[in-house]
């Protein structure tokens, strides 16, 4: 028990990558707990993370139901134990999050180069089509399934021996580029959604170089 009053949550922040979506907030609770609710603009409020002492709540299960909807969350503060509440007229304290539209705002996760194959002076570079937590007909969709042609990949490549980078883009997950015979090249890719105004680009993938295990070479 105690007399510390319940305080409202603040700094509500969406953290989302490839639709894995977590709401974070402050403060760390002292003599209080939180329950989170999430809603679409036209929908009903659904409670999650009941009576928690965490300052984050995984809302992925809710947002993947329709990633093109705009969501709003709110965090309720309740007194723990026999602590007074500051809510007026018995109303619980809560704070609203900013709006969040997963399709437009989720961060693009760091891509991975799945493989590259050299045939003569051509190299085929394949980007792993990462699985998301978005479902359709009980199967998880890939990033490409969700974004379709809105998603492009940019390939950065350079000769092992030089610093000059070249670029190439694709609306699929594969690149076919020309290389100089007998030269080793290094590759890095980046996911991009050109139509976005925020979170347009992912971080670059780890660099992969020819002569390492991911490559195949055929004359």
């Amino acid at each position: 028990s105690g007399t510390t009053n319940t305080v409202a949550a603040y700094n509500l922040t969406w953290k989302s990558t490839n639709f894995k979506t977590i709401l974070e907030w402050e403060p760390k609770p002292v003599n209080q707990v939180y329950t989170v609710q999430i809603s679409t603009k036209s929908g009903d409020w659904k409670s999650k993370c009941f009576y928690t002492t965490d300052t984050e709540c995984d809302l992925t299960d809710e947002i993947v139901k329709d990633v093109k909807q705009t969501y709003l969350a709110r965090v309720f503060s309740y007194p723990a134990g026999n602590v007074e509440s500051t809510g007026s007229a018995g109303e619980p304290l809560y704070e609203n999050s900013p709006e969040f539209t997963p399709y437009l705002e989720t961060n693009l996760g760091q891509p991975t180069i799945q493989s590259f194959e050299q045939v003569g002076t051509k190299v085929n570079v394949t980007v792993e089509d990462e699985r998301t937590l978005v479902r359709r007909n009980n199967t998880f969709l890939s990033l490409r399934d969700v974004f379709g042609k809105d998603l492009i990949y940019t390939l950065y490549y350079w000769k092992d021996s030089s610093t000059g980078r070249k670029t190439n883009t694709t609306h699929t997950n594969e690149f076919l580029i020309d290389v100089d015979k007998g030269e080793n090249y290094c590759f890095s890719v980046q996911a991009v959604i050109p139509s976005r105004t925020v979170n347009r680009k992912s971080t670059d993938s780890p660099v992969e170089c020819m002569g390492q295990e991911k490559g195949e070479f055929r004359e």
Epitope: V33, T35, Q37, D44, W45, K46, S47, F50, Y51, T53, F76, Y78, A80, G81, P92
Partner: antibody
């Protein structure tokens, strides 16, 4: 099997306190919330509050705020509900009930057998 | 607090009849509603969670549905062992609240 076993019936005088125990077995005690629900004779069910056994954090219905205290003993997988300043309206059967898994976090999937508390002068 | 208005408060039906109980929430509670069965002198038993999901081991003659703030609990074919009081319970808002109960009897 999963079960909750509660302490026996109590008769108390107005103004006194009562402490009811609920011993859990057959599952990992710390992984499930425990709730207390009461039922006055011939009446419906009334939620009193919740305790998280892993951290001991409690949340009470405002109606019972200041009069109820829920505690737990992880060494014996037991939760306790103490109600003070008893009055005749507190005469009821008191149940502990386990909160379900994450799928149904606030559905009460396992119940104790109930403890009858009679408040009479 | 959220009020859960359950109706009817009691009903009498014949074995094999379809029995329907409704619960209306005083405000939107999403699908955060559970149904319990309580037989005389016994603790309640969870039948349906999240408005329409059947708890493991519960006979399929029991079902639940939602339309907005109205929730329906149905026994498709009443059996003698279904004599009990049935309660709805919402958990979308603190504090958790129950409906007043519906007593089901056999004609």
């Amino acid at each position: 099997q999963v079960q909750l076993v509660q302490s026996g019936a109590e008769v108390k005088k107005p103004g006194a306190s009562v402490k009811v125990s609920c011993k859990a077995s057959g599952y990992t005690f710390a992984n499930y919330y425990m709730h207390w629900v009461r039922q006055a004779p011939g009446q419906g069910l009334e939620w009193m509050g919740i305790i998280n056994p892993s951290g001991g954090i409690t949340v009470y219905a405002q109606k019972f705020q200041g009069r109820v205290t829920m505690t737990r003993d992880t060494s014996t997988s037991t939760v306790y509900m103490e109600l003070s300043s008893l009055r005749s309206e507190d005469t009821a059967v008191y149940y502990c009930a386990r909160g379900g898994s994450k799928v149904a976090a606030l559905a009460f999937d396992i119940w104790g057998q109930g403890t009858m508390v009679t408040v009479s002068s | 607090d959220i009020q859960m208005t359950q109706s009817p408060s009691s009903l009498s039906a014949s074995v094999g009849d379809r029995v329907t109980i409704t619960c209306q929430a005083s405000q939107d509670i999403s699908n955060s509603l559970n149904w319990y069965q309580q037989k005389p002198g016994k603790a309640p038993k969870l039948l349906i969670y999240d408005a329409s999901n059947l708890e493991t081991g519960v006979p399929s003659r029991f079902s639940g549905s939602r339309s907005g703030t109205d929730f329906t609990f149905t026994i498709s074919s009443l059996q003698p062992e279904d004599i009990a009081t049935y309660y709805c319970q919402q958990y979308n808002f603190h504090p958790l609240t129950f409906g007043g109960g519906t007593k089901v009897e056999i004609k």
